[in-house]
């Protein structure tokens, strides 16, 4: 009878182990393991009839196909062999033990116990069938093992051979070198490569295999497992395969594909090739006068470009336009794409114009092309030249008027300041005992006119201010308060404001400048109890045009000290110029200013304590802060009055020559102006430099409206 | 002609808020102040603050300063005035006016738990 | 803040007669930069909101009867009606727009 067993290890016995068994007896066992493993046979005890060759008694291990091992006797001899030590392994998962004994024994035998177990197959050392082992790398687990590959590669569906993806190679250079994959190492089994080599229409492939030519073939039938196919437009060409490269091919189209085929098996080492595209020849370009073309070659065919460029100081021009360089291209049909143009030397074309400034022509009839030079100047005595530089500009190669400092950059005309055009007289005579300035004495002098509509009688009220640049206007921060209360600072909005520039008699206005405000500026800590921080600017809405009765002051440099005791400034305005007049007698001369022509007087610095002391003196609560210096006589006599306010007190300065704002009519009294011992008091502009310049955006020609020591 | 136009009578519990306002017409409203006055009987007129609605910017009598918040909406040329914390000391007649020219219709303000 | 001071705080006079009203204030209202007096006279008839009479001190608002003049300067102003009118039945109050805004007492028009 037969016994199929189907467990990974078990025991065999002879029939009545471990009596003797019985006589005319026949049992197999079928032992069958998982795929993957092998079954190992051994014998604990053996003992069976001896015969010549086992023809009695015997155990045949066995698979489907082969007989393993037949054993007899006890032990071995020339004509039989026991197991003794030996060890049976199937070599597959399958393993017959086939026990037979004969029909007689002549004394007892005890039969056999054997013992097998499932043991894993190691495939990978034990697989030499190039179909069956893994292309790359195996690796074996029990029961079973897999393939797998290296970098770049990928397994096969047939999970064994590997294979690389590369069917998106396209090639669109005109020059080239294409591979079979990993050349000249053997090529990738079970692989399908597509290689596309793509050109612009006109140009036609040429192919060249190189020396190595290696690819699986056979003897009789052409190209079975491995090739080389190409198709050029309706042709296809190939396969080849074998040792022997094909000769040159001239496709005679600018589109090639390229098939390149690996069966599952093989080491071939594949294949190389050079393309290359040819196309219709041109012919040589001329050269143009005062040009170059680069590169310069023997011949020129489709698709090759070349760059026609002028010498130094010249440009190419191609239908009336200029440029650097220009490029021309090999057509299909054998032709350049473009005429060859001509090198047109370099025109800088009309200089721009300078604002407030002149160009002059160096170069005779006013020439403007390559190395011809102008100069520009800034209009004087007005404006000057930013960095103080010569102004000479040179036409350069590139056709662009270049400055050896500047550059490419135009000049720039900074407003001259504290420069009148009429000098102020040395002596004045006893606004307050002053007298009527000339036009032009005070150029910087601007009249403020503010009309605050947004409350209900409109009000109306002038001051004075001081141009510091063509946009801005320095005045006091109380000129631009509105008036209705007293205890509080609200800006009047920029609308109710307008500036006059250039102003000498009020009654005659048509010869002044007058301009709107963009932006009215209070000192942010202005303080209406005490009038600290009494400053503030006007941007003007365009900038102002500057001539001899319309000029800027200086700024003074930043220091502290502010102007030194007893040195003389000036002063204007357009405030009370009559010592008898009260403020109470002149109210009913209703808004206009309270002088017609424009007033100055000449003022000396008073020592801080001293106006300080005056002050403090008062019944009032004055309060003279370092921020404020005083002006005036102790006699009194002179001085600035009601409507003079933030008008500049103006100092020389000596090493410039310049007129520096130092000052800003502030306040004064209570009594009249021009009182003995009441000096005026002026904001201390040294103070807010720094401030000024953050509002008005610090300049590049800083120093240009700023007197520095 | 101009005209200030007065939201209606309000009776508002202690501690609560309200908001008046004060419909500008025949002007441009965003350019000219509009000033707020509060009338108790026998205790005359009293200056609360004003606003430009143009720019926002605003003035307040320091005693009311708290009490009283000035907005206005240039689109629809109002201006409102908010009285929070509300007592019985704020019962009163409450006027707009133009600067110091136009006065409002008023807006009567009785505070009662 | 500057006080206001109205007097008298009432009068009655007869239709026809002439009416002078006092308003002082505690400091000046003269504002040197604008020549202006910062003073207005308002009317405030019963339920009724106040109207504009005089601004800057003396200036007639527009509308307004020539029998209503304002005089003053500094400190001291004065309201005078010519010929009181029956429709002139009225409390009369002065502000001061100098500063931050106040107003006299007012001063109560009867008539006989």
């Known amino acids: 009878h037969t016994v199929e067993l189907n467990n990974m290890f078990g025991q065999i016995q002879s029939p009545g182990y471990p009596d003797s068994y019985p006589s005319d007896s026949e049992v197999t066992w079928n032992i069958t393991v998982p795929e993957g493993f092998r079954i190992k046979l051994y014998f604990m005890h053996f003992n069976l009839e001896s015969s010549y060759l086992c023809e009695y008694d015997y155990v045949k291990v066995e698979t489907e196909e082969q007989v393993l091992a037949t054993f007899c006797g006890r032990e071995t001899t020339d004509t039989e062999q026991t197991p003794g030590q030996e060890v049976v392994f199937s070599p597959g998962s399958f393993m017959s033990i086939t026990f037979r004994s004969d029909f007689s024994n002549e004394e007892r035998f005890t039969g056999f116990d054997a013992h097998y177990m499932a043991v894993d197959v190691d495939e990978c050392t034990e697989r030499e069938d190039e179909e069956l082992s893994c292309d790359h790398y195996c690796h074996n687990y029990i029961g079973g093992y897999y393939c797998s590959c290296r970098f770049g590669y990928l397994l096969h569906t047939d999970n064994r051979t590997c294979r690389v993806e590369c069917s998106d190679n396209v090639y669109t250079q005109r020059t080239g070198v294409i591979t079979s994959p990993d050349f000249p190492n053997p090529y990738p089994k079970s692989s399908e490569c597509f290689y596309t080599i793509e050109l612009e229409e006109g140009f036609m492939v040429s192919l060249q295999f190189e020396d190595i030519f290696d690819i699986e073939d056979h003897p009789e039938v052409p190209c079975p497992y491995d090739y080389i196919k190409i198709k050029a437009g309706p042709k296809v060409l190939g396969p080849f395969c074998g040792e022997k490269a094909p000769e040159p091919i001239n496709t005679e189209s600018h589109s090639v594909q390229i098939l390149f085929r690996s069966d599952n098996s093989g080491e071939n080492q594949g294949w190389r090739l050079s393309y290359r595209a040819t196309g219709n020849e041109c012919p040589d370009p001329e050269l143009p006068v005062h040009g170059k073309i680069e590169p310069l070659q023997a011949t020129y065919s489709f698709k090759d470009q070349v760059l026609i460029s002028c010498d130094t100081g010249y440009k190419v021009l191609k239908d009336n336009v200029e440029m650097d360089t220009f490029q021309i291209e090999c057509l299909k049909d054998g032709t350049w794409s473009n005429r060859i143009p001509t090198c047109k030397i370099a025109d800088c074309g009309a200089p721009a114009e300078l604002k407030h400034g002149l160009i002059t022509f160096s170069t005779r009839n006013n020439l403007t092309t390559y190395k011809s030079e102008i100069q520009y100047s800034c209009q004087q005595p007005y404006y000057k030249m930013l960095h103080n530089i010569t102004g000479v500009y040179t036409c350069s190669a590139q056709g662009v008027w270049m400055n050896e400092v500047l550059g490419r950059s135009q000049p720039t005309c900074l407003p001259v300041c504290g420069q009148p055009s009429r000098s102020l007289p040395n002596l004045v005579k006893r606004i307050i005992g002053g007298r009527n300035a000339e036009p032009g004495l005070f150029p910087w002098q601007a009249l403020i006119v503010v009309e605050d509509t947004s409350r209900v009688p409109n009000d109306k009220w002038f001051g004075s201010g001081a141009l510091l640049s063509e946009s801005w206007i320095l005045t006091a921060a109380h000129v631009l308060r509105s008036q209705r209360r007293d205890n509080t600072v609200t800006p009047v909005s920029k609308e109710h404001v307008t500036v006059y520039l250039g102003l000498h008699d009020v009654r005659d206005k048509s010869g002044a400048v007058n301009s709107s405000a963009a932006q009215v500026v209070l000192h942010p800590d202005f303080n209406i109890q005490n009038y600290n921080h009494d400053i503030a600017l006007v941007q003007l809405r365009e900038p102002v045009p500057l001539g001899p009765h319309v000029m800027p002051i200086c700024l003074p440099s930043p220091e502290p000290e502010g102007p030194e005791p007893h040195m003389l400034g000036l002063v204007a305005g357009w405030g009370i110029s009559n010592p008898n007049v009260t403020v109470d007698e002149i109210i009913s001369s209703g808004t206009r200013t309270l002088s017609d022509v424009l007033q100055y007087v000449k003022l000396p610095v008073v020592p801080y304590a001293e106006c300080k002391t005056s002050y403090e003196s008062r019944s009032g609560n004055y309060s003279v802060t370092e921020n404020m210096f005083c002006a005036g006589y102790y006699e009194g006599g002179k001085d600035t009055c009601l409507g003079d306010s933030g008008g500049a007190f103006v100092i020389l300065d000596d090493l410039s020559q310049r007129w520096v704002a130092q000052g800003l009519v502030s306040w004064g009294g209570p009594e009249e102006c021009g009182s003995k011992q009441v000096y005026g008091v002026y904001t201390k502009v040294s103070n807010y430099v720094d401030w000024l310049w953050e509002q008005m955006g610090s300049p590049q020609g800083l120093g240009d409206l700023q007197v520095e020591r | 002609q101009v005209q200030l136009k007065q939201s209606g009578a309000e009776l508002m519990k202690p501690g609560a808020s309200v908001k008046l306002s004060c419909k500008a017409t025949g002007y441009t409203f965003t350019g000219k102040w509009i000033e707020w006055v509060k009338q108790r009987p026998g205790h005359g007129l009293e200056w609360i603050g004003e606003?430009?609605?143009?720019?926002?910017?605003?003035n307040y009598n320091e005693k009311f300063k708290g009490k009283a918040t000035f907005t206005a909406d240039s689109s629809s040329n109002t201006a409102y005035m908010q009285l929070s914390s509300l007592t019985t000391e704020d019962s009163a007649m409450y006027y707009c006016?133009?600067?110091?020219?136009?006065w409002g219709t008023g807006t009567t303000v009785t505070v009662s738990s | 803040d500057i006080v206001m001071t109205q007097s008298p705080s009432s009068l009655a006079v007869s239709a026809g007669e002439k009416v002078t009203m006092s308003c002082k204030s505690s400091?000046?209202?003269?504002?040197?930069?604008?020549?202006?007096?910062?003073l207005a006279w308002y009317q405030q008839k019963p339920g009724q909101s106040p109207k504009l009479l005089i601004y800057w001190a003396s200036t007639r608002e527009s509308g307004v009867p020539d029998r209503f003049t304002g005089s003053g300067s500094g400190t001291d102003f004065t309201l005078t009606i010519s010929s009181v009118q029956a429709e002139d039945l009225a409390v009369y109050y002065c502000?001061?727009?100098?500063?931050?805004?106040?107003f006299g007492g007012g001063t109560k028009l009867e008539i006989k």
């Open positions: 606003i430009l609605p143009g720019t926002g910017s605003t």
């Open positions: 006016l133009r600067s110091e020219d136009v």
């Open positions: 502000k001061q727009s100098y500063n931050i805004p106040t």
């Open positions: 400091q000046s209202l003269l504002n040197s930069r604008t020549r202006k007096n910062y």
